[in-house]
Interface confidence: medium
């Protein structure tokens, strides 16, 4: 059956032979209606990429550099399955390219000019492409030929396989630049030895190199890693201090109509039958015909790449930056230490309007990028299409798991002028009901619920976390009879109460009328039994404070809070009747952009923050008539975080634990991708 056939692309006679053997052996173990293998032979990996894009083949396994080529237009391929190394219990699908230095040296990443460098080899990922790609814009001009620019940047190097005649400085630390193990400074161990011997000041290797060469922790402690933010970390902190995370070997397919489920079904069956130590007749991860045919010999198995993970996310911002710099050879005209405009990520139409207005008022210091969901915005910040946005704590957690950092906190209670330097404790997550109802925390089953959005703190993580510990399952849509929790599956009962309009029904953005704090409260007013919101929501939308038709006649005393002990209290008493304390919303950014974002926002709030009294005639950053566009409307200021500059420190241990527990119930495709 052609639609059940996976056309594998082979790039040599030996690969084609192994592919045919793969095809025949899979035929013998799979049912006739299962997936099958067909083999397509091409002259090179690039030809395979083009063939897949043109629907003449379906899959090929590629190294990271080629995954980048495959992702570029017009190919538009995406990673679908990753080879893993190490054990099944602790599978490694990536390695980290790092810059290792001796602890007793005193320079940072931005002070490498004039140092001596040790590389694994010319054109190799961790040893050349990544470090030189990331340093590219700091190299002296002209930057072509690249080897000459690198030779003029460092005071001496060992770059195995470089041309020692044309570029003698690149071979200064290893005469002749030998391209094999005859050169004592060749490859990973060699580059590390070059540092260890004191020939070089920095070695560009992979994270495991130091562990493979120094079994003793005391010896490893004599070395540190250089981080991109110009700090240093210990060698075992490579996940937080690396030049780039590099995928090892990856199966790619078309982004649209790519048969990714079929490819996974095929490879999953293949690893069951012909994986490591499974079969004598045919081995997926070795071959009598040659090394690394179709798959790496060192692979131990396959893992399915999460569907939300596109090539940009898979390769990572640092890796793409490095490769793009090397390939395109373009650098910004502005010096790299100057802050470029900050691209704010706006959710859907109304936020985009406010962002455009901010952009004009900021004289172009703010630019705007749009996405339809918060997770799409986070992904855009990760891959460099956007730089920053302000997020509810639940999304600060997801952003943190995806490598972003909190930059500034929204403060709601601290009056100026101390606001900017005050760390607030957070706000209360509350459950609101109508005073006329007989509901308590203990009899919510079967009732109609209203949530700000799935994954948000007050509207979801806190109430559903508490509920989970009571009911011990994730079927919240069965617990409530119906509800509106924007971001739920469209056919779920938790989309039933949402107002839309269609096609935006239940979408987690302002196009859904019941989205966010005000939306969830409106849902309670018009349809629901309970709303999970922040403690300020009722006062902010009653007593004529919200002029919209649905809210203008509402009275605060018609609503009450549910307390966890089964009692109820007035909305004026959140301190004594709340579900939990929630961390304030916070601005997040990539690490490399955090300082610029902070500086610019502090400057912007001085001009457009809460000191502006007349928002009818001036642009106000924290005002949007109860719609919480870009920031919460009750924000007094954006405050510095001081030492709370990681998502764990910012959110606090208790909240992180609660959200981590709820991950069993996670419906976040982005979180799944970021924890892959």
């Amino acid at each position: 059956v052609p639609e059940k056939s996976v056309r594998w692309c082979a790039v040599s006679e030996h690969e084609a032979t192994k592919c045919q053997s793969f095809r025949d052996h899979m035929k013998s173990v799979l049912p006739s209606n299962g997936p099958s293998v067909a083999c397509v032979k091409k002259a090179s990996h690039l030809d395979c990429i083009r063939a897949i894009a043109a629907n003449e083949a379906d899959a090929v396994t590629l190294d990271a550099g080629l995954v980048y080529d495959a992702y570029l237009a017009p190919n538009n391929l995406k990673p679908v399955v990753a080879e893993f190394y190490g054990s099944k219990e602790d599978p490694q699908t990536f390695y980290y390219a790092v810059a290792v230095v001796k602890k007793d040296s005193d320079f940072q990443m931005n002070q490498l000019r004039g140092r001596k460098s040790c590389h694994t080899g010319l054109g190799r990922s961790a040893g050349w492409n990544i470090p030189i790609g990331l340093l590219y814009c700091d190299l002296p001009e002209p930057r072509k030929p690249l080897e000459k620019a690198v030779a003029n940047f460092f005071s001496g190097s060992c770059v195995p396989c470089a041309d020692g005649t044309d570029f003698p400085q690149l071979c200064q630390l290893c005469p002749g630049c030998g391209c094999s193990t005859l050169n004592q400074y060749f490859s990973y161990s060699g580059a590390f030895k070059c540092l260890k011997d004191g020939a070089g000041d920095v070695a560009f290797v992979k994270h495991s190199t130091i562990f493979e060469n120094l079994a003793n922790k005391a010896d490893r402690d004599q070395y540190e890693l250089l981080c991109l933010d110009n700090t240093r970390k210990s060698v075992d902190e490579y996940k937080d201090c690396h030049l780039a995370r590099v995928p090892s070997h990856t199966v790619v397919a078309r982004s649209v109509g790519g048969k990714e489920d079929l490819i996974w079904e095929l490879l999953n069956q293949a690893q069951e039958h012909f994986g490591k130590d499974k079969s004598k007749e045919f081995q997926l991860f070795s071959s009598p015909h040659g090394k690394d045919l179709l798959f790496k010999d060192s692979a131990h198995g396959f893992l399915k790449v999460p569907p939300r993970m596109d090539a940009k996310m898979y390769l990572g911002y640092e890796y793409i930056t490095a490769i793009r710099n090397l390939r395109e050879g373009t650098c910004p005209e502005a010096p790299t230490d100057e802050c470029k405009p900050v691209k704010w990520c706006a959710l859907s139409h109304h936020e985009r309007l406010k962002c455009d207005e901010w952009s004009v008022n900021s004289a172009g210091k703010i630019e705007c990028e749009s996405a339809e969901t918060t997770e799409d915005c986070i992904a855009k910040i990760m891959n460099g299409e956007a730089d920053a946005m302000s997020l509810d704590g639940g999304f600060v957690y997801i952003a943190g798991m995806c490598g972003l950092v909190p930059v500034l906190a929204e403060n709601y209670n601290t009056p100026n002028p101390n606001c900017e330097n005050t760390a607030e404790e957070g706000y209360f997550a509350v459950a609101v009901v109508k005073s006329s109802s007989d509901l308590t925390w203990d009899n919510l089953k079967g009732k109609k619920s209203c949530h700000t959005a799935v994954g948000r703190t007050a509207g979801w993580n806190i109430p559903m976390g508490l509920l989970y510990s009571k009911i011990n399952h994730c079927r919240f849509d069965e617990f409530f009879s119906e509800g509106c929790a924007p971001g739920s599956e469209k056919n779920s009962s938790l989309c039933k109460l949402c107002m839309g309009p269609s096609p935006n029904l239940c979408e987690p953005n302002n196009k859904e009328g019941y989205y966010g704090y005000t939306g969830a409260f409106r849902c309670l007013v018009e349809k629901g039994d309970v709303a999970f919101v922040k403690h300020q929501t009722v006062p902010q939308n009653t007593g004529g404070k919200n002029p919209d038709a649905w809210a203008k006649n509402l009275k605060e005393e018609d609503y009450e809070l549910l307390c966890l002990d089964g009692s109820r209290k007035s909305v004026q008493e959140p301190a004594n009747c709340h579900l939990a304390r929630a961390p304030n919303h916070a601005v997040v950014a990539r690490k490399d952009k955090a300082d610029c974002v902070q500086t610019l926002l502090l400057d912007q709030q001085r001009m457009f923050g809460s000191s502006v009294t007349d928002c009818s005639s001036n642009f106000c950053l924290f005002e949007s008539k109860t719609k919480d566009l870009l920031f919460r409307d009750d924000t007094v200021c954006l405050a510095k975080l001081h030492d709370r500059n990681t998502y764990e420190k910012y959110l606090g241990e208790e909240y992180v634990k609660a959200v981590t527990n709820l991950r069993k119930c996670s419906t976040s495709p982005l979180l799944e991708a970021c924890t892959f």
């Epitope: 309007l353 004009v360 005639s617 949007s624 719609k627």
Partner: nanobody
Framework: EVQLVESGGGLVQPGGSLRLSCAAS????????MAWYRQAPGKGLEWVSG???????NYRDSVKGRFTISRDNSKNTLYLQMNSLRAEDTAVYYC???????????WGQGTLVTVSS
């Protein structure tokens, strides 16, 4: 009720010029930030240029140096002078008043600009 009426569009050859106008009534024009947006056939709405009440301006990169936004507060009118027009400028052009009081959809009917030889 805010009313915005755009005019001045038409057919023009590549390299030619047009001046668009937008008359506003019922709005707080003189104290609002104003902007031009455009929508090319089959594409989404994109921001072109904006001007604050004090007259500071901002443009999308692709029109910088070719388009000039201005306003006449006494006439409640917004302008967009478009020079060196290109085929990719073909679109329906809309003006909007987005004072921070309004995040509602106040859009006029737009004016069509076609750049073609």
């Amino acid at each position: 009720e805010v009313q915005l009426v755009e005019s001045g569009g038409g057919l023009v050859q590549p390299g030619g010029s047009l001046r668009l106008s937008c008359a506003a009534s019922g709005s707080i024009f003189s104290i609002a930030t104003m902007a031009w947006y455009r929508q090319a056939p089959g594409k989404g709405l994109e921001w072109v240029s904006g001007i604050t009440r004090s007259g500071s301006t901002n443009y999308r990169d692709s029109v910088k140096g070719r388009f000039t936004i201005s306003r006449d507060n006494s006439k409640n009118t917004l302008y967009l002078q478009m020079n060196s027009l290109r085929a990719e400028d073909t679109a329906v052009y809309y003006c909007t008043d987005y004072s921070s009081r309004y995040y509602h959809d106040y859009w006029g009917q737009g004016t069509l600009v076609t750049v073609s030889s």
